[in-house]
Interface confidence: low
């Protein structure tokens, strides 16, 4: 009977870690000679299995090839890895007496596609916090997937963003692939509660995409608005000054009261008020004993937020010398300050 080597499947897909069978049947055992499995073609092809009884990790013949009438030379590869991807050929050789065995026929080849899941996407952002209206880049990386086809999308608070760049490497054929995508986001002051999501869809994920999340609270700084106001006097000898730092993030805040440029009180906020947008407010009260001041006094509220340069607001309290009523004091904000509030 004429020899024919048949590999019925053009391709098989297998998930990493699973087993696959590569089928190969012959129509004749003649001429005498071995059957071998190779991956690839040409001089660099790799011998996979030769039915010579030797132990090959993860590969077994499916049927008993020692039987005289066996025509089935299929093999099972177990615990498949992305490195097993490629085209496998079942090849019949004619045994040589003195010279090497001669290849006389090959099957058509079976391509093994190894389906490997992408790793959970990791989203990284800038090392330093950005400020509202600044553009910052986020990068999403996932690796180890196969085949190469993959979809990556970016979202911010449910709205799709377009990436600056998305690359899948390597560009040629490979056992597995990596994806990297960068998106640029415009920060705004309401972003403390916002999230940037990188979503990866792949054939191995069965319509359940993987997601990587970056909380913008880790990447944004909202500087406080600072106001100094005078409250109604609680008694004849006292003036209440209030320094209010509003809508800041993160929580790191130091507040110092100064009298005529000299530190009067260090205030380390403990009970911050949280706003619905995720930012914080803090109010510091400073009780001024009016009887202690006959001259004008400039009170300064100095706010240091998140290691940034201090924000200062001045408020001048007029001493008794300016007042006809000995039981009261006058105050007004310093009009020479860069920013003034009444």
């Amino acid at each position: 009977k004429e020899l024919k080597v048949t590999q019925p499947e053009k391709s098989v897909s297998v998930a990493a870690g699973d087993s696959t069978v590569l089928n190969c049947t012959l129509t004749s055992l003649l001429p005498v000679g071995p059957i071998r499995w190779y991956r690839g073609v040409g001089p660099s092809r790799l011998l996979i299995y030769s039915f010579a009884g030797e132990y090959v990790p993860r590969i077994r013949n499916v049927s008993d090839t020692t039987k005289r009438n066996n025509m089935d030379f299929s093999i099972r590869i177990s615990n498949v890895t992305p490195a097993d991807a490629g085209i496998y050929y079942c090849v019949k050789f004619q045994k040589g007496s003195s010279e090497p065995d001669t290849e006389i026929q090959s099957g058509g080849g079976t391509e093994v596609y190894v389906l490997a899941k992408p790793s959970p996407p990791e989203v990284s952002g800038p090392a330093d916090r950005g400020i509202p209206d600044q553009k910052v880049n986020f990068t999403c990386k996932s690796h180890g997937f196969s085949p190469r086809n993959i979809t990556l999308k970016w979202f911010k608070d449910g709205q799709e963003l377009h990436p600056l760049e998305t690359t899948v490497n390597p560009s040629g054929k490979n056992v597995s692939y990596n994806i990297s995508s960068t998106v640029r986001v415009v920060l705004n002051s309401m972003d403390v509660n916002s999230k940037v999501i990188c979503e990866v869809a792949h054939i191995t994920l069965d319509r359940s995409p993987l997601r990587g999340i970056a909380n913008l609270s880790n990447f944004i700084r909202v500087s406080p608005t600072v106001k100094v106001t005078q409250q109604s006097p609680t008694s004849m000898n006292q003036v209440n000054l209030t320094c209010r730092a509003e809508r800041f993030y993160p929580e790191d805040l130091q507040l110092i009261w100064l009298e005529n440029g000299n530190v009067s009180r260090n205030d380390t906020p403990k009970n911050l008020t949280k706003n619905t947008d995720g930012t914080y407010n803090y109010t510091s009260l400073f009780l001024v004993n009016s009887s202690a001041h006959r001259e004008d006094v400039v009170f300064t509220c100095q706010v240091k937020h998140d290691q940034q340069p201090a924000i200062t607001r001045n408020h001048t309290v007029l001493g008794f010398a300016h007042s006809s009523d000995q039981g009261s004091m006058q105050t007004f904000p310093d009009n020479n300050a860069t920013h003034n509030w009444n």
């Epitope: 209206d133 600044q134 553009k135 709205q159 799709e160 963003l161 377009h162 990436p163 600056l164 760049e165 640029r184 415009v186």
Partner: antibody, heavy 119, light 107 residues
């Protein structure tokens, strides 16, 4: 290749709303990857960015014009539009639409349309 | 807003000359800077993006460099068709802002 074409009235009366449309040909707004922008140029002056829109409707506006500007997109017609309300003579300019890629700048521009605000 | 200061505002050079235009940002904008060419009566044309990348189809005599606050645009050998006004534009911070322009003329 992608081409942009502005259209709209060349003369608008003060206090009225300026309306312009940019028609995109040779490519789909919905394909993503780009913002679609409006820029203007006052006579003999430099360029001023008005705002940009993504196909999903996400917009960015120049704060100096934000209270008067609306940019919208109609993906079915492959168009995006600019509305500028309460115009004055200071809004007289050449108005350009452009395609904006963050990584590639404003790489495609319309030829521009002159809008004069006058009674 | 980020202020973009371009200099000079105009220049005159001979064909074949090397022409340099500078653009200074009021704060650090990394490499988020584009350069455009605008000929009279025409729309601007993108020449350089991300400070130093040549846009598609732009002759190699045009180049850009710089990062942070100081940027340079160079025409290595001025050609008659290069008569135009050149603008820088930052896209690091909203709103996007342009330089005042540099008008290039032939002597």
């Amino acid at each position: 290749q992608v081409q942009l074409q502005e259209s709209g009235p060349g003369l608008v009366k003060p206090s009225q709303t300026l309306s312009l449309t940019c028609t995109v040909s040779g490519g789909s707004i919905s394909s993503g990857g780009y913002y679609w922008s409006w820029i203007r140029q006052h006579p003999g002056k430099g360029l001023e960015w008005i705002g940009s829109i993504y196909y999903s409707g996400s917009t960015y506006y120049n704060p100096s014009l934000k209270s008067r500007v609306t940019i919208s997109v109609d993906t079915s017609k492959n168009q995006f539009s600019l509305k500028l309300s309460s115009v004055t003579a200071a809004d007289t300019a050449v108005y350009y639409c452009a395609r904006e890629g963050y990584h590639s700048g404003m790489d495609v521009w319309g030829q521009g349309t002159t809008v004069t605000v006058s009674s | 807003d980020i202020q973009m200061t371009q200099s000079p505002s105009s220049l005159s050079a001979s064909v074949g000359d090397r022409v340099t235009i500078t653009c200074q940002a009021s704060q650090d904008i990394s490499n988020y800077l584009n350069w455009y060419q605008q000929k009279p009566g025409k729309a601007p044309k993108l020449l350089i993006y991300d400070a130093s990348n040549l846009a598609t189809g732009v002759p190699s005599r045009f180049s850009g460099s710089g990062s942070g606050t100081d940027f340079t645009f160079t025409i290595s050998s001025l050609q008659p068709e290069d008569i135009a006004t050149y603008y820088c534009q930052q896209f690091a911070y909203l709103p996007w802002t342009f330089g005042g322009g540099t008008k290039v003329e032939i002597k």
